[in-house]
């Protein structure tokens, strides 16, 4: 969100979407001329806008929704200009006379229009005059025009639901990034902040909201009293891509907070009647309490409503006053949400209630530095949701969320630097690939770092002045750092190895982090950029030669020792990190710091050693830990792939999530490459004798799975026991699923299952039974009430073993009236996670890219995840020539953002052949042994 | 090329409510800005009421604002004036206008386009 994030899947962050837009076109224009040039020019900035809106919900006599609209741009001149650039995409204005009406403000003298024209590629409406505009002088631009009101998910679109059997119909907006254009004419760039004065003219039954509160009362429109006029509060001055507005007949529940600040949680009437947004409500007021404390400022504006739409493409949107979700990120139903929803639903709000400040307050220059406002939120996250849900230990779960999730990627060489230089980013396209998982996950890890080894206290001290002294204006990353190095200058406690800036470059300007590497009997550290295909070429040069200022926590023999800052050199030696023979050193506590750590074999030994004597002694994230980065590191040649399975011998005593969740998600990995082989029967026995005394433990616990436990890693790891034991084949979990699913089914008004379990429960079910099970689970889809429970549905039906049926949910998924088209994509992905429906779902995505492409275009990041969902597999000669086939085969289509998850998916692929290859006979062997 | 027809003229007692209409003819009417005129015997053509191409301009000469509304139908290809609490000063030819422009106008020399006119009397 754009997070925003699109957590279809149970705690599987991803980015958000936004519109893309593939054209090389551009190169061919005269560049001279500033109407062919994507950047607006200087010359005018806009001061206020006076925007009034008319959405028609229902369609005209071409059967096409619409809506009118009428601006008035206030603009000033900066330089002499004799054209006035202003955004403008899909909108028409009258083709009688101009297309515009200027006129001078005050004194100032206005030329005549010559001519005004509509620059498609480039999304302008360029006015061409006869004379010049004189720089100090005002005027304004009047325009009315009128869009389609369509179902497309950006810019002013409506989005539809049915209520029993009438279909409703409701007008919003997504503007990010560059959707504001298409709903009026706008200079429509982040430091092209100004005020916004919005009127809402809409039938007078329906409710009109947008980002302020509005001036008094609706009043009926003079000409025809069914419609009604919301005139809105003017807002600060701000920035384009956070305009919100909408029309529906949605209904809220409200507090006022102590400060006086209306907080306002909007969905469907049913939702609202069933107090569906009661959590919402409950946990907004103290976090937004908390970020106004963490960045010593008040909430800027006079109301904070959230709403919950049934269309929507990203996970959230952090709209000014108006934030938008979908229905899954805001909306939650003890009766039927399961304990990961109510972590979706306060992380997502956490996240987007901390960019009313960082990133709407005070706002980026320009889109190359988006990595910080979301990664910034997206660490802050985790602050505002543990604030809010303090017994959780939620800020434990950026480890797994997002440090390791994005090491992934970061460890490719075809990953990026976090900073992009401006000048590369400049098509819609351009700036739709920055909403990655680099700049929200990796710029969520790094800006964590930073905050650890500042200390909390002294960061926040640098981001409350950083705040006040840009509110209402624009930055770029370079100004934060400023403001933090005054708050380290200003104190003597917390000493730094080089300046705030120099060690912050080294993260930023460069792509991957290193492995530590520590040799325990000489104490000897060293550094290394990780790849995990140690034979990859990185064709990116660095300006630091892949060196990093490394900030070093560690733990010998559960003793907390003294920080170390490893500079950027290769190598260096601290007695720190020497042992005696007996003892262990661990590095990087809680990982706080964005690298990996790799010791010599009989460190290795001894952490294993201690882990299954007295586990306790490493802290828990320590434990998962040792498992992610050894993992990590045999993929990358470093340690043999025995040592990492050695790793998780110590599961068996492990009660914990972390350890097992950095376990499965590693391991995942070996089931995707050999879930079509023999390897996979020893592998699946390991993991249940491994599993079943978690899943004994959880049994008893809950007395026999009808309770629940207390706090919510225990509930996360009860979820993974029943989740690993049953598909691993435990008698006793399958017997579980299908008797609680079989009561279910005789009795379809009462569902036995506890939400927690659902997603496991259900997906074991479809996948031990048959078309009886399908269906019936389909039928209970098409009535869910709450997008919950429909998202664990549709997820779980891709568990089929039956190709068929597999083969007909893909052909649903290209129907918007079964699969909304926002969850198009991870349905399309859902059935590709299932080793029978992979196959299936990559013919299907090959036969059908054009027309996803086209019909799909709106959700640019949908895209990457897609080409990502159903190549994972790929591990054969044979599947690469596929996909560079698909490659050709759709180059006149285009890739949109998904183009870079295609060269991902190609280097994944090789590493993927290569790594098989080498591993299959030893990993048999293991798991054999082991069995 | 734009043919604009008025009707809904008539005679009404003053306090009363007339409705007219303007049909016009020519595909571009939904760009245009539409305005009606009125012309008193012995006295000059004076502006009434003018709408933008979208509809969400409307001006109103101040004697007939909260009395008259102006409003159009593009499917129809119609403008319309609603005239209530109508006063014996109100008694006129109504005229028409199209203008080769979107933006609503009070001037009389900015449309290029004139109806016939429908006659509207106002008995006290």
């Known amino acids: 969100y754009a997070q925003e994030k699109n957590k279809n899947a149970e705690h599987v962050p991803q980015a958000p979407t936004s519109p893309t837009i593939t054209t090389t076109a551009a190169i061919t224009l005269d560049q001279s001329k500033p109407w062919n040039r994507y950047r607006l020019p200087t010359t005018l900035l806009p001061d206020s806008y006076n925007v009034t809106l008319r959405p028609y919900l229902t369609p005209n006599a071409d059967g096409l929704y619409i809506f009118k609209g009428k601006s008035i741009v206030r603009l000033l001149c900066q330089e002499p200009t004799d054209v006035i650039i202003i955004h403008s995409k899909k909108l028409n204005y009258t083709t009688q006379g101009h297309m515009v009406v200027l006129r001078g403000v005050g004194d100032s003298q206005v030329p005549e229009i010559d001519r005004t024209e509509l620059v498609e590629l480039t999304e302008y409406l360029v006015v061409h005059l006869k004379g010049s505009l004189q720089p100090g002088h005002m005027y304004e631009m009047e325009s009315e025009f009128q869009g389609e009101l369509a179902d497309d998910l950006a810019g002013f679109y409506r989005s539809e639901y049915m209520e029993g059997n009438v279909k409703k119909v409701l007008a919003t907006t997504q503007m990010q990034s560059t959707d504001a254009r298409k709903s009026f004419p706008c200079f429509d760039e982040p430091a092209m902040k100004a005020t916004f004065n919005i009127t809402l003219i809409h039938p007078n039954n329906l409710t009109a909201l947008s980002n302020m509160p509005p001036k008094g009362s609706s009043t009926p429109l003079a000409e025809d009293p069914n419609w009604s006029v919301t005139e809105f509060e003017t807002t600060p001055v701000m920035s384009t891509y956070l305009l919100a507005y909408i029309v529906s007949e949605f209904q809220s529940v409200n507090e006022t907070a102590q400060n006086g600040v209306l907080i306002r949680i909007w969905a469907r009437p049913n939702a609202i009647a069933e107090g569906h947004g009661m959590y919402a409500l409950n946990v907004t007021g103290p976090i937004l309490n908390f970020f106004a404390n963490h960045y010593n400022t008040s909430y800027p504006l006079p109301k904070s409503d959230q709403i919950a739409l049934p269309d929507f493409n990203a996970g959230a949107m952090e709209n000014w006053g108006l934030v938008t979700y979908r229905e899954n990120a805001l909306l939650f139903d003890p009766q039927s949400s399961s304990i990961s929803n109510k972590e979706r639903v306060v992380t997502v709000i956490a996240h987007e209630l901390a960019h009313q400040w960082f990133g709407n307050l005070v706002t980026l220059a320009w889109w190359n530095d988006l990595w910080l406002n979301e990664g910034f939120a997206s660490y802050v996250e985790y602050l505002g949701a543990d604030h809010a849900e303090p017994t959780w230990n939620l800020k434990d779960l950026i480890v797994p969320g997002d440090v390791y999730r994005v090491m992934a990627v970061d460890a490719l060489a075809s990953s990026h630097p976090l900073t992009t230089p401006a000048e590369e980013v400049n098509t819609p396209a351009q700036i739709s690939e920055m909403f990655d998982s680099i700049s929200y996950s990796k710029g969520a890890s790094v800006i964590r770092m930073l905050s650890n080894f500042l200390t909390e206290d002294l960061f926040k001290e640098g981001l409350a002045s950083y705040l006040h002294a840009f509110a209402y204006q624009n930055t770029t990353y370079l100004d934060l750092w400023e403001h933090l190095q005054k708050a380290v200058d200003a104190q003597t406690s917390i000493r730094l190895p080089d300046t705030v800036r120099a060690i912050m470059d080294r993260w930023t300007l460069q792509m991957g982090f290193p492995v530590i590497t520590v040799d325990t009997k000489t104490g000897n550290i060293s550094q290394k950029h990780f790849l995990l295909d140690s034979e990859s070429n990185v064709t990116r040069s660095s300006a630091f030669d892949y060196l990093w200022i490394v900030p070093i926590s560690s733990i010998k023999n559960g003793v907390m020792q003294d920080h170390y800052w490893l500079r950027d050199v290769s190598q260096a030696q601290n007695d720190l990190f020497k042992t005696a023979s007996d003892d262990w050193v661990l590095l990087n506590v809680n990982v706080t710091g964005y690298f990996q750590v790799n010791y010599d074999e009989d460190n290795w030994r001894m952490i294993q050693h201690q882990l299954q004597t007295n586990l306790s002694v490493i802290p828990v994230i320590n434990r998962a830990q040792v498992i992610y980065d050894s993992f990590n590191l045999a993929t990358a040649h470093m340690v043999p792939v025995t040592l990492a399975l050695d790793n998780t011998l110590f599961l068996n005593g492990e009660k914990e999530y972390m350890p097992w969740q950095a376990a499965l998600s590693s391991l995942s990995y070996f089931s995707l490459m050999f879930d079509r082989s023999e390897v996979y029967g020893p592998m699946k026995k390991y993991l249940r004798k491994q599993v079943e005394p978690l899943f004994q433990h959880f049994e008893t616990l809950t007395k026999n799975w009808t309770e629940r436990p207390e706090n919510l890693m225990d509930q996360y790891s009860e979820i993974n026991a029943i989740s690993t034991a049953c598909s691993n084949g435990l008698p006793q979990c399958e017997n579980l699923a299908k008797t609680l699913f079989d009561q279910w089914m005789s009795d379809p008004e009462n569902n036995p299952i506890h939400p927690n379990l659902r997603s496991t429960i259900y997906c074991n079910a479809i996948a031990q039974g048959g078309q009886d099970q399908w269906d019936f689970a389909w039928g209970q889809l098409q009535q869910a009430q709450l997008v919950n429970e429909a998202d664990k549905l549709r997820s779980a039906l891709a568990c089929s073993n039956e190709v068929w049926l597999l083969n007909r949910y893909l052909g649903y998924t290209l129907n918007p009236d079964l699969i909304r088209k926002q969850d198009a994509t991870s349905t399309i992905n859902s059935i590709a996670s299932n080793v029978i429906g992979q196959p299936l779902a990559w013919d299907f995505v090959q036969s059908n890219w054009k027309k996803l492409f086209q019909d799909y275009g709106g959700g640019s990041f949908s895209f990457s995840n897609l080409i990502q969902g159903v190549t994972r597999r790929f591990s054969s000669e044979f599947e690469l020539q596929q996909l560079e086939q698909f490659k050709k085969n759709n180059m006149d289509v285009g890739f949109g953002s998904g183009t870079r998850a295609l060269e991902q998916a190609l280097e994944k692929t090789k590493a993927n052949i290569k790594w098989v290859k080498e591993n299959k006979e030893v990993v048999l062997n293991w798991f054999i042994e082991h069995s | 090329q734009v043919q604009l027809q008025e009707s809904g003229g008539g005679l009404v007692q003053a306090g009363g409510s007339l409705r007219l209409s303007c049909a016009a003819s020519?595909?571009?009417?939904?760009?245009?800005?539409m305005g009606w005129f009125r012309q008193a015997p012995g006295k000059e053509r004076e502006f009434v009421a003018a709408i933008s191409w979208t509809g969400l301009t409307t001006n109103y000469a101040d004697s007939v604002k909260g009395r008259f509304f102006i409003s159009r139908d593009d499917a129809k290809n119609t403008v319309y004036l609603q005239m209530n609490s109508l006063k014996p000063e109100d008694t006129a030819v109504y005229y028409c206008a199209a203008r080769q422009s979107g933006y609503a106008s009070k001037f009389l020399d900015e449309y290029g386009y004139w109806g016939q006119g429908t006659q509207v009397t106002v008995s006290s």
């Open positions: 020519g595909r571009t009417f939904s760009s245009n800005a």
